[in-house]
């Protein structure tokens, strides 16, 4: 709001701008005939400091110098980095309603001499590209500060270009636009900046570099790849480059990796064969140029060509294990099931497995397709069985994993000993064991095989297992392992043609029991009362019962309950007692115990006996 | 417990056609295979068919051409149809289905229907 200093003007000494710690002069005076109207003497003549447009201080104090009337200077210090705006106004003091008039006003710029510039980095992007070079342009001077960058180079070349910093924009890249082609390969340039600013002028030390210094290539583009004899492991890479690389650098990973596979190519003129690649796999490819083997800058990475390789037949053996069962009285059915291949196995899509069972002397062969990873079919109880599966997908399949069919838990000489089960954590039960003690014939192998406690259909919940080498005596089973849930676990001894077995209940956390058993009827037989009951439901049992207590007492006595501890079996829904008096009426309930304690007690039910006193 | 409940059966002339139904109820959220036997007179029970939930069929070898196995999953039934009937097809025919319980297997069986093949 300065009326172009009509009433006056605002002077500085010994300049508008000054180094950090200077002190100033600043005199305000007025133009001939402007002041107070009739009474010159009264003219006051103020001085205010602004920062970012706020007032911060009334300079009254400060004056050094004044010509009633007609000037005054004032003296300031202590001013801080950057600008400070500086206002006079007159003060007509017979008129105490009026406000200062302003006369005139002032900018004082507070800043430091720009330091030498450093680190000067030179680069040129591309063959075509143009020379820019940056710069470190040291310490803020707070004052408006023009960098000339200076080059020079044989045959008299020279390049300069301009900028400048100040509170808006910062300056410490300049691109010259002159372009440096490889025929001056072996020449050296030299670059300099200068800065200047009211308050001084700095150069950098000269920076020389010559072509190969500063000249990064363009990344590669246009990556292509083609797959030898659609070959899921060899391949080549393809890509244009500028026409002066002699060295690239390929990084290759499948799409999941953490880790790059590096590859240095010299003189590959954008082709290079790939020969350990994993089929059926996404892959990222990169490549970078350099246009020279020892010197020189590598380019940024290419953008990324992601492609899947093609399928390769199946490797590796499929897992078999089975199931066998009666059903009738001559007929069996058998479940075989098999996992899944690992990706790396698979080498692509499977479409489906083949599945023979063939009985070994009479040559008969049952063969079949199926997309499942089960099949299940009815054959005869007699003749030695065996199975086989394998794995096909586009480009072939995998070759046969052959199964004996054997009575899995039909000699008890093959049976494990000393089968335990510890739950190890929330989802893992260790399974430990110890040979069998007499097997006619030696362990090829154990399966450590388990199954929930829970009411499943036999093929929409399949087994869970383990193939254990004949040395080892423990597995750790964590596959489908939930707290809270009683499975059955068994280990089974093969050797080439029988099978021994053992069981042990396991589960990997538990609780007390949510309910006890649910007492349904109690008779007499014989002097004895049988106590008969329902299970408790598979969700409530919250782990494996150990096992029930019958309890009873006399009815209103409050003496303690007697009871009669019985080992849980599913198969087992009554127990006889027979130390209950005869007609004496009792109440009896049950409760099932868990390994981290005992159920509240089921339903209670009153009985009185009639016979005779055991 | 899962129940079973056939129908359907009748007698019939040599070379007829009869459709045998079964339904299950209960706790049938873990019924998968469903199976058809039969139990001549004087004869033991022995296996006719079964059916997966995936819908993959197995016949007795003596039934196999002549009987197809179904099943219905919205209405938890399975069917078997029997084409060119003979005498000896003459039983009483179950409907049988299979859970599994840890490695205990638990067997459910219907009352029976029976056919008669006699012209």
């Known amino acids: 709001n300065i009326d172009v200093c009509k009433l006056g003007t605002v002077t500085v000494q010994p300049a508008p701008v000054i180094p950090l710690g200077s002190a100033a002069n600043i005199s305000c005076s007025l133009n001939p005939k402007q002041g107070c109207s009739h009474y010159p003497s009264s003219n006051e003549l103020i001085l205010l400091k602004f920062v970012n447009d706020v007032l911060v201080e009334n300079l009254h104090g400060k004056k050094v110098h004044d010509h009633t009337g007609h000037s005054s200077t004032f003296q300031v210090t202590n001013l801080s980095l950057g600008m400070t705006l500086f206002v006079c106004k007159l003060n007509c003091s017979n008129s105490q309603k009026k406000p200062p008039v302003p006369v005139c006003g002032v900018e004082i710029s507070v800043g430091v001499a720009p330091e030498p510039p450093q680190n000067i980095s030179c680069v040129q992007e591309g063959e075509n590209g143009t020379v820019a070079c940056s710069w470190n342009s040291g310490k803020v001077t707070y004052l408006k500060t023009n960098y000339t960058l200076q080059l020079s180079g044989p045959n008299n070349l020279t390049c300069q270009k301009q900028c400048f910093s100040d509170n808006r924009q910062n300056c410490n890249r300049l691109d010259l636009g002159i372009n440096l082609s490889p025929d001056l390969a072996e020449s050296r340039f030299i670059v300099r900046v200068t800065a200047i600013n009211d308050l001084g002028n700095s150069s950098s030390l000269p920076h020389t570099f010559t072509f190969l210094d500063i000249v990064i290539p363009l990344p590669p583009w246009d990556i292509r790849i083609n797959f030898l004899n659609a070959s899921g492991s060899r391949g080549t890479l393809q890509w244009e480059d500028e026409g002066q690389v002699v060295l690239n650098q390929l990084r290759y990973q499948p799409l999941n990796s953490t880790s790059w596979n590096m590859v240095n190519a010299t003189n590959a003129k954008g082709k290079y064969d790939l020969r350990d690649l994993r089929p059926f796999t996404e892959y990222e490819f990169q490549i970078s140029s350099k246009l020279h083997l020892s010197g020189g800058s590598w380019s940024n990475w290419s953008e990324s060509l992601r492609t899947r390789t093609p399928e390769e037949e199946p490797v590796g053996i499929l897992d078999i294990w089975y199931m066998k069962q009666d059903i009738d009285y001559d007929r069996q059915q058998i479940s075989l099931f098999w996992k899944s291949l690992n990706p790396s196995e698979a080498r692509g899509k499977i479409l489906h497995y083949q599945v023979t069972l063939q009985e070994v002397t009479k040559k008969t062969t049952l063969q079949n397709t199926t997309r499942h990873t089960s099949w299940t079919r009815v054959i005869p109880r007699t003749g030695a069985w065996t199975a086989s599966v394998s794995a096909a997908n586009s480009k072939g399949a995998s070759a046969p994993t052959h199964i004996n069919i054997v009575d899995l838990c039909g000699t008890g000489l093959l049976a494990p000993h000393q089968v335990s089960a510890k739950s190890e954590n929330m989802d893992n039960i260790l399974v430990t064991w110890q040979p069998p003690k007499k097997a006619d014939s030696a362990v090829r192998e154990y399966i450590v095989e388990w199954r929930a406690l829970q009411p499943g259909s036999i093929t929409k919940f399949p087994p869970h297992w383990l193939r254990i080498p004949p040395d080892n005596m423990s597995a750790l089973i964590s596959e489908n392992i939930k707290p809270y849930i009683c499975y059955e676990i068994r280990v089974h001894a093969l050797s080439e043609s029988q099978g021994g077995c053992s069981s042990i209940r396991g589960d990997s956390k538990h609780k007390a029991p949510v309910s006890g058993p649910h007492i349904t009827a109690i008779t007499e037989k014989k002097e004895r009362l049988f106590i008969s009951w329902t299970h408790i439901p598979f969700p409530e049992q919250r782990g494996c019962i150990l096992h029930y207590r019958i309890y009873w007492k006399e009815r209103d006595s409050t003496a303690q309950p007697e009871l009669c501890e019985i080992q849980y079996r599913r198969s087992q829904n009554s127990h006889p007692i027979s130390s209950l008096q005869p007609r004496v009426t009792y109440v009896l309930w049950m409760t099932a115990v868990t390994a981290a304690g005992e159920s509240p007690q089921g339903n209670e039910r009153e009985f009185c006996p009639q016979g005779k006193a055991n | 417990q899962v129940q079973l409940q056939e129908s359907g059966g009748g007698l019939v002339q040599p070379g007829g056609s009869l459709r045998l139904s079964c339904t299950a109820s209960g706790s049938i959220f873990a019924i998968d295979d469903m199976y058809w036997y039969r139990q001549a007179p004087g004869k033991q029970r022995e296996f006719v068919a079964y059916i997966t939930a995936t819908n993959s069929a197995n016949y007795l070898d003596s039934v196999n051409g002549r009987f197809t196995i179904s099943r219905d999953n919205a209405k938890n039934s399975v069917y078997l149809q029997m084409n060119s009937l003979k005498p000896e097809d003459t039983a009483v025919y179950y409907c049988?289905?299979?859970?599994?319980?840890?490695?205990?297997?638990?067997?459910?069986w219907g009352q029976g229907t029976q056919v008669t093949v006699s012209s």
């Open positions: 049988n289905t299979k859970q599994i319980v840890g490695f205990q297997i638990d067997e459910y």
